[in-house]
């Protein structure tokens, strides 16, 4: 946990393991005031390491739907549309926080969970393994 | 919210706006049981669209530290190390959930917040705008 002095106006915690269990308001505030309003919408198709997005659904998780990227090829696509296998497509992964219902099926009780998701793919120069 | 029948073994909610405010256990469970154990560790440097990682810190947020990717070039790096400006390096962005202390400085009260982060970069063929 992060040691921050308690403000007198804070909600009181009845949890003796404070602050292991906290109150979370699920009214999501959206901070996406990005100067790039256009998301990675069509990058998956235009990339030299293109990917497909797969829907991962789990009603016991919040958010229940997460999109997972899978690289289309092991190599990278050249200007002529053919795949160059001297380069490698690799997934760009990120650890994200989700809420997992705990106990299961409970609508108002969750546990924080870290999951690794693949967001897209990038083209990299391969690691050359030199044989001794 | 997601309408899921309440299990009789669930913690009771005293919030009249149930399930707007929920209990969350901050003991993070780590689900990273990936068949690809190798993370995107050195991809930022080996990519044809390399990026730098910038530390974004906010003590009022959980997690307090988030790493943001910034593409190094507008173009993409060729095999000879030179930049090809006929291709574009673009950030792959993802919306993630974080917890924002609300009221501020309170250790046990949060609000869910969506933020857009750049996870890495990929090399794309540019969109050609034809002038009429």
């Amino acid at each position: 946990g992060i040691a921050i002095p308690r403000n007198s106006g804070c909600p009181n915690s009845e949890d003796k393991n404070f602050p292991r269990t906290v109150m979370v308001n699920l009214n999501i505030h959206n901070r996406n005031t990005s100067t790039n309003p256009k998301r990675s919408s069509d990058y998956y198709n235009r990339s030299t390491s293109p990917w497909n997005l797969h829907r991962n659904e789990d009603p016991e998780r919040y958010p229940s739907v997460i999109w997972e990227a899978k690289c289309r090829h092991l190599g990278c696509v050249k200007a002529d549309g053919n795949v160059d296998y001297h380069m490698n497509s690799v997934p760009i992964q990120q650890e994200i926080l989700v809420l997992r219902r705990e106990p299961r099926h409970c609508p108002n009780s969750f546990r924080l969970e870290k999951i690794l998701v693949s967001v897209g793919c990038t083209c990299v120069t391969p690691i050359v393994h030199h044989v001794a | 919210g997601i309408a899921i029948p309440r299990n009789s073994g669930c913690p009771n909610s005293e919030d009249k706006n149930f399930p707007r405010t929920v209990m969350v256990n901050l003991n993070i469970h780590n689900r990273n049981t990936s068949t690809n154990p190798k993370r995107s560790s050195d991809y930022y440097n080996r990519s044809t669209s390399p990026w730098n990682l910038h530390r974004n810190e906010d003590p009022e947020r959980y997690p307090s530290v988030i790493w943001e990717a910034k593409c190094r070039h507008l173009g993409c790096v060729k095999a000879d190390g030179n930049v090809d400006y006929h291709m574009n390096s673009v950030p792959i962005q993802q919306e993630i959930l974080v917890l924002r202390r609300e009221p501020r400085h309170c250790p046990n009260s949060f609000r869910l917040e969506k933020i857009l982060v750049s996870v890495g970069c990929t090399c794309v063929t540019p969109i050609v705008h034809h002038v009429a």
Epitope: N88, V124, I127 | -
Partner: antibody, heavy 124, light 113 residues
């Protein structure tokens, strides 16, 4: 259970277009990609092409100029069209589901469920 | 295109005895990023469509008996059946899933002696 069923005319005239349909059940179309493979009589297997879960396609360059694979998700159907056919296109045509593996971050190009195949003869 | 070469093309076997099929690829199927070899094995029983036995060289598809095992790396691969059973007869194909177009070996016909 997972099922794939090919259908279409068993006889096609030379220079015409071969059209086959693959009707699937028992799995989610948005998750899986589907490939078409053919097997000439008494010969081995030849991969024709794939349609990915998002609708994009990749074709074997040997067929590229004359093949089209598409999907109609509302009917759970995939289709294969092969134009300008010759006697060399006589084969059993299979549709097959590409394996989907959770927590693995590449598309798979091995097939874990196959249709029973349909024989197409090209002859005048 | 990648050429997949199987040997032998015909394999007479005795039930209860082991059997082995070789598959060679014209290029390495080892992906440096994850150290996986992109080779699969299928069995096409008489009058049936192919069924997946093994992928990534050695991972058995669910429901496949453990008498089937795969090994190898780079360009040389082997499928072994520890004790052949009558139901194992048919044509075995190796397939590379690394390079497009994804190509198959010419097949090995396994039959009971």
């Amino acid at each position: 259970q997972v099922q794939l069923q090919e259908s279409g005319p068993g006889l096609v005239k030379p220079s015409e277009t071969l059209s086959l349909t693959c009707t699937v059940s028992g799995f989610s179309l948005p998750s899986h990609s589907v490939s078409w493979i053919r097997q000439p009589p008494g010969k081995g297997l030849e991969w024709i092409g794939i349609i990915w879960n998002q609708g994009g396609t990749d074709y074997n360059s040997a067929f590229k100029s004359r093949v089209t694979i598409s999907v109609d998700t509302s009917k759970n159907q995939f289709s294969l069209k092969l134009s300008s056919v010759t006697a060399a296109d006589t084969a059993v045509y299979y549709c097959a589901r590409n394996a989907y593996i959770t927590d693995y971050y590449y598309e798979n190009y091995f097939m874990d469920a196959w249709g029973q195949g349909t024989l197409v003869t090209v002859s005048s | 295109d990648i050429v997949m070469t199987q040997s032998p093309l015909s394999l007479p076997v005795t039930p209860g005895e082991p059997a082995s099929i070789s598959c060679k690829s014209s290029q390495s199927l080892l992906f440096s990023e994850n150290q996986k070899n992109y080779l699969a094995w299928y069995l096409q029983k008489p009058g049936q469509s192919p069924q997946l036995l093994i992928y990534w060289t050695s991972t058995r598809q669910s429901g496949v008996p453990d008498r089937f095992s795969g090994s190898g790396s780079g360009t040389d691969f082997t499928l072994k059946i520890s004790r052949v059973e009558a139901e194992d007869v048919g044509v075995y194909y190796c397939q590379q899933s690394y390079y497009t177009p994804y190509t198959f070996g010419q097949g090995t016909k396994v039959e009971i002696k």
